[in-house]
């Protein structure tokens, strides 16, 4: 098939209160070139979780865990999970610009919040 | 058994032109980024196109932008570097290789030696 | 551009002992965890065979006297123990930014 394919394996994800939660994400190709960024929600009203490059996300870190050849691991996980935390996560792919494009969108994971 | 065999090269005069072209076997072309690597006894290894698997996007470093051209056919399983503008500091082994992910190279050619010489 | 600086050029062990060669990079090659350096291995007459993928993945088909370490800017290939087969050139290449750039190769050879 054409270019990379963008891949969210879990559709869901439910996490306690104050746990962490890893989103997974993995990419089967750095071509076309340009960065992965992490959104919540979809849409002009998305908010940006996470974007390697540039900005300041204390929740956030990576967590690289697949050694396959076939694809790249773009995985993060968020620390300190409050309720206000749920919605959907989309990883997206961008090709590098100026500015830069959306090129494709993973499936997106709902998260769910228990409570403690 | 995956197979790279790049053809098309040979001595050119310089502001000439040469046509390279790899033939893929042994494995599903069409899902690999392809790639020319040149190693020059002096500058070693370095990197000179990539084409998305689809054929869509390709890149080039700025010592050949301009002058390449890189395509490829998926119906044939083949790579072709169109070299126009030939210089003397091309003059290079030229591999054709492979890259599932678009990352590492995983598999490479013989290659095919191109001299620029007057 | 990232350089990559590869050191030594050229080294001589002797056999079952250890090799150990560097690679810097002028700039991270990191993103998301995955570190895009990877090693190759090149004999006389032969083009390069990948041996190491993202820093430390040992490529199939490679024997494990081969690991890779090292993350953002510095890189390592070991090579333990030394075999007499393992004579050749070894080439690092970043592919965490384009240009895609390599390593200028450190010649293996027995003491």
């Known amino acids: 098939e054409e270019e990379l394919q963008v891949i969210q394996p879990d559709k869901s994800v439910s996490v306690a209160a104050g746990e962490s939660a890893i989103l997974h994400c993995t990419v089967t190709s750095l071509i076309p070139v340009g960065p992965i960024q992490w959104f919540r929600g979809a849409g002009p009203a998305r908010e940006l979780i996470y974007n390697q490059k540039e900005g300041h996300f204390p929740r956030v870190t990576t967590v690289s865990e697949s050694t396959k050849r076939e694809n790249m691991d773009f995985s993060i996980s968020i620390s300190n999970i409050t309720p206000a935390d749920a919605g959907t996560y989309y990883c997206v792919k961008f090709r590098k610009g100026s500015p830069d494009t959306e090129f494709k969108s993973g499936a997106g994971t709902e998260l769910s919040v228990r409570a403690k | 058994e995956v197979q790279l065999v790049e053809s098309g090269g040979g001595l050119v005069k310089p502001g000439g032109s040469l046509r390279l072209s790899c033939a893929a076997s042994?494995?599903?072309?069409?899902?690999?980024?392809m790639s020319w690597v040149r190693q020059t006894p002096g500058k070693g290894l370095e990197w000179v196109a990539t084409?998305?698997?689809?054929?869509?996007?390709?890149y080039y470093p700025d010592s050949v932008k301009g002058r390449f051209t890189l395509s490829r056919d998926n119906a044939k399983n083949s790579l072709y570097l169109q070299m126009n503008s030939l210089r003397a500091e091309d003059t290079a082994v030229y591999y054709c290789?492979?890259?599932?992910?678009?990352?590492?190279?995983?598999?490479w050619g013989q290659g095919t030696t191109v001299t620029v010489s007057s | 551009d990232i350089v990559i600086t590869q050191s030594p050029a050229s080294l001589a062990v002797s056999l079952g002992e250890r090799a150990t060669i560097s690679c810097r990079a002028s700039?991270?090659?990191?993103?998301?965890?995955?570190?895009?350096m990877h090693w190759y291995q090149q004999k006389p007459g032969q083009p390069p065979k990948l041996l190491i993928y993202?820093?430390?993945n040992l490529e199939s088909g490679v024997p494990d006297r081969f690991s890779g370490s090292g993350s953002r800017t510095d890189f390592t290939l070991t090579i333990n123990p030394l075999q007499a087969e393992d004579v050749a050139t070894y080439y690092c290449?970043?592919?965490?930014?384009?240009?895609?750039?390599f390593g200028g190769g450190t010649k293996v050879e027995i003491k």
């Open positions: 290789a492979s890259q599932l992910t678009g990352s590492e190279f995983d598999y």
């Open positions: 042994g494995f599903t072309f069409s899902s690999y980024v």
């Open positions: 084409i998305s698997s689809g054929g869509t996007y390709t």
């Open positions: 700039e991270s090659v990191d993103s998301y965890g995955n570190s895009f």
């Open positions: 993202r820093a430390s």
């Open positions: 290449h970043q592919s965490g930014d384009l240009p895609w750039t």
